[in-house]
């Protein structure tokens, strides 16, 4: 069964900078990746970025840079311009649409005890559904 993993990492040098890493474990070709925060895409979450393998990437503030890391994983850099960091308690979700499997989505957040530079464990937490 395909799985999606999500890691959230606080940058050690800039406490207002976070990176979300997501990956797809499974066969099939990825047709679209959607990253959202505050919940899953289409279920209360706010879209942060869309990555299409051919057409490119589109992102919304506070996302700073979305990019493919491999053919099955992406990263999204976020920058909090405010004094406090709302990202620390936020859930980030990644949805991978693939053919022929359908859509798979998982969410993750920075562990409360995380020190800068540490990341959430890469354990897949398949919430929601396979569309």
């Amino acid at each position: 069964t395909p799985e999606v993993w999500v890691q959230v990492q606080m940058e050690a040098t800039e406490l207002s900078s976070f990176t979300v890493h997501c990956g797809f474990l499974g066969p099939g070709s990825i047709s679209l990746v959607t990253v959202s925060w505050g919940g899953p895409d289409g279920a209360g979450g706010t879209k942060l970025a869309v990555l299409h393998p051919e057409l490119g990437t589109r992102q919304w503030a506070p996302a700073r840079q979305a990019r493919w890391e491999t053919q099955s994983s992406i990263s999204l850099a976020l920058e909090d311009s405010g004094a406090s960091s709302p990202f620390a308690n936020t859930t980030f979700c990644c949805k991978f649409a693939s053919f022929p499997e359908g859509s798979w989505e998982s969410c993750g957040s920075l562990p409360p005890s995380s020190d800068p530079g540490l990341s959430a464990p890469p354990t897949p937490v398949p919430i929601l559904r396979a569309d």
């Epitope: 051919e54 490119g56 990437t57 589109r58 990019r67 493919w68 890391e69």
Partner: antibody, heavy 120, light 113 residues
Framework: QVQLQQPGAELVKPGASVKLSCKAS????????MHWVKQRPGQGLEWIGE????????NYNEKFKSKATLTVDHSSSTAYMQLSSLTSEDSAVYYC?????????????WGQGTSVTVSS | DIVMTQSPSSLAMSVGQKVTMSCKSS????????????LAWYQQKPGQSPKLLVY???TRDSGVPDRFIGSGSGTDFTLTISSVQAEDLADYFC?????????FGGGTKLEIK
């Protein structure tokens, strides 16, 4: 063929607002994001933002977030950009541009541009 | 934001000559998924709106003469006009279409001697 029609010129007073229009024809209006680009006289091009006519979702260049507001009217296949609190720095030609899904940010079709002059 | 830098700012060439202009980006425009470079070139003739010439660094848009050749990868890109014609008098802009916000270079003005 794809056409994006824009009025030729607008003369506005400092501090006022102006709403620029871009009427699309020759393609399905809701199928492509509409982009807006600024060009000051003799200078380069700056991307202001984009709007998805199918759902109204917008995306702005941070630099223009408090300056521009993008909207669409499906019934007339027209995109609009409102510019507020105008100053001389806003005097420029403003283009609308749509893309043909070659890539998210290629601007394949351009309007002729509206020249905005801010003067008292 | 990705910064795009073009050079030279202007050049004057005779009809039939080969023209090359450069565009550099502050970060790589190479998409590691498909190994494509997300770089476009536009031509803007005097008094007209810009026109897309090349995208994905080297793919000519439909109807663009084959004397326009885009090349390069990563952060360094070139637009070559193999044999310049009088109608090529224009400003040429590069633009990254890699990510939001798309950004343009300052342009290269091509004059015909």
């Amino acid at each position: 063929q794809v056409q994006l029609q824009q009025p030729g010129a607008e003369l506005v007073k400092p501090g006022a607002s102006v709403k620029l229009s871009c009427k699309a024809s020759g393609y399905t209006f809701t199928s492509s994001w509409m982009h807006w680009v600024k060009q000051r006289p003799g200078q380069g091009l700056e991307w202001i933002g984009e709007i998805n006519p199918s759902d109204g979702r917008t995306n702005y260049n941070e630099k223009f977030k408090s300056k521009a507001t993008l909207t669409v009217d499906h019934s007339s296949s027209t995109a609009y950009m409102q510019l507020s609190s105008l100053t001389s720095e806003d005097s420029a030609v403003y283009y609308c541009a749509s893309n043909a899904d070659r890539a998210y940010y290629t601007m394949d079709y351009w309007g002729q541009g509206t020249s905005v002059t801010v003067s008292s | 934001d990705i910064v795009m830098t073009q050079s030279p700012s202007s050049l004057a060439m005779s009809v039939g000559q080969k023209v090359t202009m450069s565009c550099k980006s502050s970060q790589s425009l190479l998409n590691s998924f498909n190994q494509r470079n997300f770089l476009a070139w536009y031509q803007q003739k005097p008094g007209q709106s810009p026109k897309l010439l090349v995208y994905f660094a080297s793919t000519r848009d439909s109807g663009v003469p084959d004397r326009f050749i885009g090349s390069g990868s990563g952060t360094d890109f070139t637009l070559t006009i193999s044999s310049v014609q009088a109608e090529d008098l224009a400003d040429y802009f590069c633009q990254q279409h890699y990510s939001t916000p798309p950004t343009f270079g300052g342009g290269t003005k091509l004059e015909i001697k």
